[in-house]
């Protein structure tokens, strides 16, 4: 039978660490991490790490009992957890019978938004107590709400990941810029900022009709040339406060008729601010 892995939590040092080993298995040949989605009962889904590793193809894998994987996450707070993956059989060959290296994976470490993870793995038995053993580590930075997978998470939807404000902005005259955008039922307060290397104008927008999508319009006084300036729209939603996803547009000249500039010439540009 071919070896498989059985993985479970192991928070402290592995018991083998206390024992003296004449020989230990070699290090891993490769270690990779990628996010995968799994649905959960609430109708939302969670993002988990798929940690996969490749064993070095030589006789030292005959000594291999397990591989231990530890993950440290750094964002607002630090997290640390480890799993030990035991091999169900001794290795009878250095490569898979069908060809290629022995490759295993573990899916289970949860992934939070916008977090840097340090994933380390080592084979067991590992080095003796006062020796450095072979190990391998990789970094993985989880994406934020702008990511094509993450944006459908409930937390991100509530932070406006699926909201497209369709910003249009045009220079009415030397002193004012008209900004139009589609509101969202997620919140009723917005800040429109006009920047041309420095901030040349801003306005708070309060939209009382929170329950339905409407097209809001605001005329903003400016203190400098606004043509080509960037409009930044910051929403204030209950779930993300002042840290919601920001959207951008560009100021163009208003048409002579005085109506706002058509949408298709000025696509909204997602900003880089994430919850």
């Amino acid at each position: 039978r071919e070896p498989t892995v059985q993985c479970g939590s192991e928070t402290g040092p592995s018991p083998e660490w206390m024992l003296q080993h004449d020989l230990i298995p070699g290090d891993l040949r490769d270690l990779r991490v990628e996010p995968v989605t799994t649905s959960v009962a609430t109708g939302d889904y969670s993002i988990l790490m798929n940690v996969s590793w490749v064993l070095r193809a030589d006789a030292s894998i005959r000594l291999l009992k397990a591989t231990k994987i530890c993950v440290t996450g750094k964002s607002n707070f630090q997290s640390y957890s480890c799993v030990r993956c035991n091999y169900t059989e001794a290795f009878q060959t250095q490569t898979r019978p069908s060809g290629g290296k022995w490759t295993f994976s573990y899916i289970g470490f949860p992934v939070e938004l916008n977090t840097v993870y340090f994933i380390g793995a080592h084979n067991i038995p590992n080095a003796n107590m006062n020796e450095d053993g072979p190990s391998m580590s990789v970094n993985f930075t989880s994406p934020g709400c702008l990511d094509h997978i993450m944006k459908y998470k409930k937390k991100c939807v509530k932070a406006g990941s699926l909201w497209d404000p369709n910003i249009t902005a045009c220079k009415k005259n030397e002193e004012t810029v008209e900004v139009n955008f589609t509101t969202t039922p997620l919140g009723n307060r917005y800040m429109a900022l006009i920047q041309h290397s420095t901030i040349i104008g801003f306005s708070q927008v309060f939209e009382p009709h929170q329950k339905k999508q409407t097209r809001a319009s605001v005329v903003i006084p400016v203190t400098g040339d606004s043509e080509g300036a960037t409009v930044q729209l910051t929403p204030y939603f209950p779930t993300c406060g002042s840290d919601c996803i920001r959207h951008k547009g560009t100021v163009v000249l208003c048409p002579q008729t005085g109506v706002p500039f058509p949408l298709d010439n000025n696509k909204s540009k997602p900003g880089g601010w994430l919850p």
């Epitope: 060959t93 250095q94 490569t95």
Partner: antibody
Framework: EVQLVQSGAEVKKPGASVKVSCKTS????????MNWVRQAPGQGLEWMGR????????QYAQKFQGRVTLTRDTSISTAYMELSRLRSDDTAVYYC???????????WGQGTLVTVSS | DIQMTQSPSSLSASVGDRVTITCRAS??????LAWYQQKPGKAPKLLLY???NLADGVPSRFSGSGSGTDYTLTISSLQPEDFATYYC?????????FGGGTKVEIK
């Protein structure tokens, strides 16, 4: 029946390169590492390196690093060993040898004599 | 690199004799050892692997023993076709090395 059939004898001048082929049959080529071993006249066996035909991972003996190149062509189940900057002490019989479950050499080619002479 | 030291480098024996060849590794190779037989002008032939396992078609008069760093190949009753050179090889991990060989000659 597992067979490893090597290319014929070569005579080369110092500084030249030689490429030896090893055509395999009777087993799944990508399932076993292929090793190269040489034997100078009247001398013992010397391991040069190995290649995993599955993904072309290669490991060389330090002595040959930078001078030997191992390749493979899975479409014709053939492994190759190229040795460059030949010297007279590279005169030897070169063998391909297929690994077993681990790196004992279960099957050998018939050998290719490479003579380096000016 | 692991060094493999074989002894003796040559020996003379008669048909029917019991022959023992030893191989010492410079460090523990955890029984990852193979023995080969080579006749003049021919490729080596695998005799034993994992110290004691006979390769396909190898007569039972060949046997192996040992562990750690010290290993032995024994031919219980030497036959005329056994006159050849014998090599040990470790496969604990690359680079793989062979012993210097033991030539078994007719007395």
């Amino acid at each position: 029946e597992v067979q490893l059939v090597q290319s014929g004898a070569e005579v080369k001048k110092p500084g030249a390169s030689v490429k030896v082929s090893c055509k395999t049959s009777g087993y799944t080529f990508i399932s076993y590492w292929m090793n190269w071993v040489r034997q100078a006249p009247g001398q013992g066996l010397e391991w040069m390196g190995r290649i995993d035909p599955y993904d072309s991972e290669i490991q060389y003996a330090q002595k040959f690093q930078g001078r030997v190149t191992l390749t493979r062509d899975t479409s014709i189940s053939t492994a190759y060993m190229e040795l460059s900057r030949l010297r007279s002490d590279d005169t030897a019989v070169y063998y391909c040898a297929r690994s077993g479950g681990f790196d004992w050499f279960a099957y050998w080619g018939q050998g290719t004599l490479v003579t380096v002479s000016s | 690199d692991i060094q493999m030291t074989q002894s003796p480098s040559s020996l003379s024996a008669s048909v029917g004799d019991r022959v023992t060849i030893t191989c010492r590794a410079s460090e523990n190779i955890n029984s990852n050892l193979a023995w080969y037989q080579q006749k003049p002008g021919k490729a080596p032939k695998l005799l034993l692997y994992d110290v004691t396992n006979l390769a396909d078609g190898v007569p039972s008069r060949f046997s192996g023993s040992g562990s750690g760093t010290d290993y032995t190949l024994t031919i219980s009753s030497l036959q005329p076709e056994d006159f050849a050179t014998y090599y040990c090889q470790h496969f604990w991990g690359p680079p793989y090395t062979f012993g210097g060989g033991t030539k078994v000659e007719i007395k």
